[in-house]
């Protein structure tokens, strides 16, 4: 039994790492391997992560974490019963996939304005909350020509865009997704999307 | 919100011992170490050790080897500090401070004097 | 005695920029990350930068942090009488990281 494909590693520096890797041949991971890790820190235990299969010959792993800081490195060691297949280490803070964003909302009720709202994915005190910026898509599928990101900068989980500048009488989505500039970091995945119905019409000129 | 209630201050003769309490609540006890800290009338200050919850595992500054214990009890999401064979110069104000970096808030600080 | 170093005071008037900084060496700063507290007087201490340069939620923007080879720096814009407090430096020591030291400190006056 040999790994193919050594294993990857990211964290949303919150609470779990995703680490992922292929094998030799076809392996049923729960039932042949384990990934050892420990927090190469004083006082740290050793941890077992047991492996899904991720096709035939991958393998996923969801590692716990807690109080992720930039300084933490941990050692990862993948064994097949007795037999050690790899030894690595992995430093969350430099393979950071940040949560996606949730509760995307479009309230239509504001005047001549659509705002889109969304949550931050992590609570006030995590180190993540104050660096995320965002990306917000909208796109329509009665237009398949209009598809257009909106970088949000600035910390507030809002956007407003003019209702005049989208068609009217057409259906929209809207879906958001984060990043984290201090870290680095690699795009969220997408927020599940959300649909409106634009009805503003402009005024009759005078 | 996170919160963390140290015991109430403390009067001790020589060579006694000191057992202060850091209450946690509003986050998941185990999943953040837990530092003790002190700082002397006027003076800065000073690192002491640091437990890890889950386990109970630690480790003491060199200067208090030997003379701090720390504890915890995690059905009442409670660390312990106890200091033994006090002298005059652990009078101080002892804080309690969660996560590797310290995060906010701490303790509010538990007075210790130390005096004959 | 602390092995990282601050001056005792520092002092300047309300709207005016303050640095205070703090030396170490290569088995702290230099192979760590710094973090920065404030002690208000009477109060517990808080945390007001960590990683160098990063700021927890609820920090004004008006304090920054740097850190070059051993040394590491707190700057403070804007001044304000509020400002007026103990700010100690700390990091993390030893391979593995098993102690944490705090700086001497440094009394911040505000005239």
């Known amino acids: 039994m040999k790994v193919l494909q050594e294993p990857t590693c990211v964290s949303d520096y919150m609470s779990i790492s995703t680490c992922e890797w292929k094998m030799g041949g076809p392996t049923n991971c729960s039932a042949e391997l384990r990934l050892l890790y420990q927090l190469v820190f004083q006082s740290s235990e050793t941890h077992t992560c047991v492996p899904e299969n991720n096709g035939g010959v991958g393998c996923v792993c969801h590692l716990l974490m807690d109080d992720v800081v930039s300084m933490d490195n941990y050692t990862l060691d993948l064994w097949a019963g007795q037999q050690l297949l790899w030894k690595g280490s992995f430093k969350p803070s430099e393979h950071v996939k940040p949560r996606a964003p949730g509760n995307l909302t479009v309230h239509t009720n504001v005047s001549d304005t659509v705002l889109l709202t969304w949550s931050n994915p992590y609570p006030p005190d995590n180190y993540l909350y104050n660096d995320l910026t965002y990306a917000v898509n909208i796109w329509s599928e009665n237009d398949p020509a209009y598809s257009r990101i909106h970088n949000v900068t600035y910390l507030k989980p809002t956007l407003r865009i003019p209702a005049s500048t989208l068609k009217s009488g057409i259906s929209y989505r809207a879906r958001v997704r984060a990043w984290a500039q201090h870290y680095n970091t690699t795009w969220s995945e997408w927020s599940p999307s959300t649909k409106w119905y634009n009805s503003y019409r402009e005024p009759f000129e005078q | 919100q996170v919160q963390l209630v140290q015991s109430g201050a403390e009067v001790k003769k020589p060579g006694a011992s000191v057992k202060v309490s850091c209450k946690a609540s509003g986050y998941a006890f185990t999943s953040y170490y837990m530092h003790w800290a002190r700082q002397a009338p006027g003076q800065g200050l000073e690192w002491m050790g640091i437990i890890n919850p889950s386990g109970g595992s630690t480790s003491y500054a060199q200067k208090f080897q030997g003379r701090v214990t720390m504890t915890r009890d995690t059905s009442t999401s409670t660390v312990y500090m106890e200091l033994s064979s006090l002298r005059s110069e652990d009078t101080a104000v002892y804080y309690c401070a969660r996560g590797k970096l310290l995060k906010n808030p701490w303790g509010k600080g538990t007075l210790v004097t130390v005096s004959s | 005695q602390s092995v990282l170093t601050q001056p005792p005071s520092v002092s300047a008037a309300p709207g005016q920029k303050v640095t205070i900084s703090c030396s170490g060496g290569?088995?702290?700063?230099?192979?760590?990350?710094v973090s920065w507290y404030q002690q208000l007087p009477g109060t517990a201490p808080k945390l007001l930068i960590y990683?160098?340069?990063k700021r927890p939620s609820g920090i004004p923007d008006r304090f920054s942090g740097s850190k070059s080879g051993t040394s590491a720096t707190l700057a403070i814009t804007g001044l304000q009488t509020g400002d007026e407090a103990d700010y100690y430096c700390?990091?993390?020591?030893?391979?593995?990281?098993?102690?944490?030291?705090f700086g001497t400190g440094t009394k911040l006056t505000v005239l």
């Open positions: 990683d160098n340069n």
């Open positions: 290569s088995s702290n700063i230099g192979n760590s990350y």
């Open positions: 700390g990091t993390w020591f030893g391979t593995p990281a098993s102690n944490y030291v």
